[in-house]
Amino acid sequence: KEEQTTFRDCAEIFKSGLTTSGIYTLTFPNSTEEIKAYCDMDVGGGGWTVIQHREDGSVDFQRTWKEYKEGFGSPLGEYWLGNEFVSQLTGQHRYVLKIQLKDWEGNEAHSLYDHFYLAGEESNYRIHLTGLTGTAGKISSISQPGSDFSTKDSDNDKCICKCSQMLSGGWWFDACGPSNLNGQYYPQKQNTNKFNGIKWYYWKGSGYSLKATTMMIRPADF
């Protein structure tokens, strides 16, 4: 049996016997184009492709449409994997989305969606989510039904304002909505009453800017 040399996601890497968390090279579906991603092989059985991570404010998340499309940052630290890759990947198979959150008081919580995909760029990478469970709120902090993605140079929200400019970062803004994990990073003791912070309303309420966030995906049949 020939050894698999290209992987579409971290679940395939895990199943190939590579079970250490770290940076791996993934290949776009139906393409030879490659992308580097962080694979979490420890959480909940492993095989998770990390699509977003915040931890210290070292990376600027107020980026352009093109940057959010292609990805930015470092997979070893803060980064955004890229909307185009995630859209293509989640359009091929059914994926779950896990969002892990940390506050400044040492608490952790998560939201798990049992079906997640992004529409294509022609639909502004609109997010589709169903089946919420977890400890970070009984109501989805990502507005339902899903919104189009907006950035500072591509305003696709439902607000009379430009949410990405007002709140900072690219996100699936509604008007503007109960979450923004790509907002401005604020350090401890400066993280409350913020209009543009890292927000997950149905866990921490309004104006609370979180310490750390991770968004990761895995095939539903893993």
């Epitope: 439902k158 949410c163 309004s206």
Partner: nanobody, 129 residues
Framework: EVQLVESGGGLVQPGGSLRLSCAVS????????IGWFRQAPGKEREGVSA????????YYADSVKGRFTISSDNSKNTVYLQMNSLRPEDTAVYYC??????????????????????WGQGTLVTVSS
């Protein structure tokens, strides 16, 4: 740093009146809407009233219409809630909160609670004989 400080709460008899104040610093009222919310023990926080100083428009929950009046003094950067004909069911901790005035959905006039990102610590209003 944005700060909102409520004052004016206390114990009042049914039918009585109170005036709550919300002193705002770190932002100017012209650019923001200020809302009053309340939370009774064991209940969800609910919207009571709100004002957009720039346009002078106001909002009231049905339960307080005709009894409560919201106003603002931009020179003092303060918003007031005049509460008349108070009832025992008005007993709650009252909070003021701020939201950028432009953060409005197309076709809507007011804001969901999750859009208010800056909050005060609250002032207790008790209506009892």
């Amino acid at each position: 740093e944005v700060q909102l400080v409520e004052s004016g709460g206390g114990l009042v008899q049914p039918g009585g009146s109170l005036r709550l104040s919300c002193a705002v610093s770190g932002i100017t009222l012209d650019d923001y809407a200020i809302g009053w919310f309340r939370q009774a023990p064991g209940k969800e926080r609910e919207g009571v009233s709100a004002i957009r100083s720039s346009g002078g428009s106001t909002y009231y929950a049905d339960s307080v219409k005709g009894r409560f009046t919201i106003s603002s003094d931009n020179s003092k950067n303060t918003v007031y809630l005049q509460m008349n004909s108070l009832r025992p069911e008005d007993t709650a901790v009252y909070y003021c909160a701020a939201v950028p005035a432009g953060r409005l959905r197309y076709g809507e006039q007011w804001y969901p609670i999750y859009e208010y990102d800056a909050w005060g610590q609250g002032t207790l209003v008790t209506v009892s004989s």
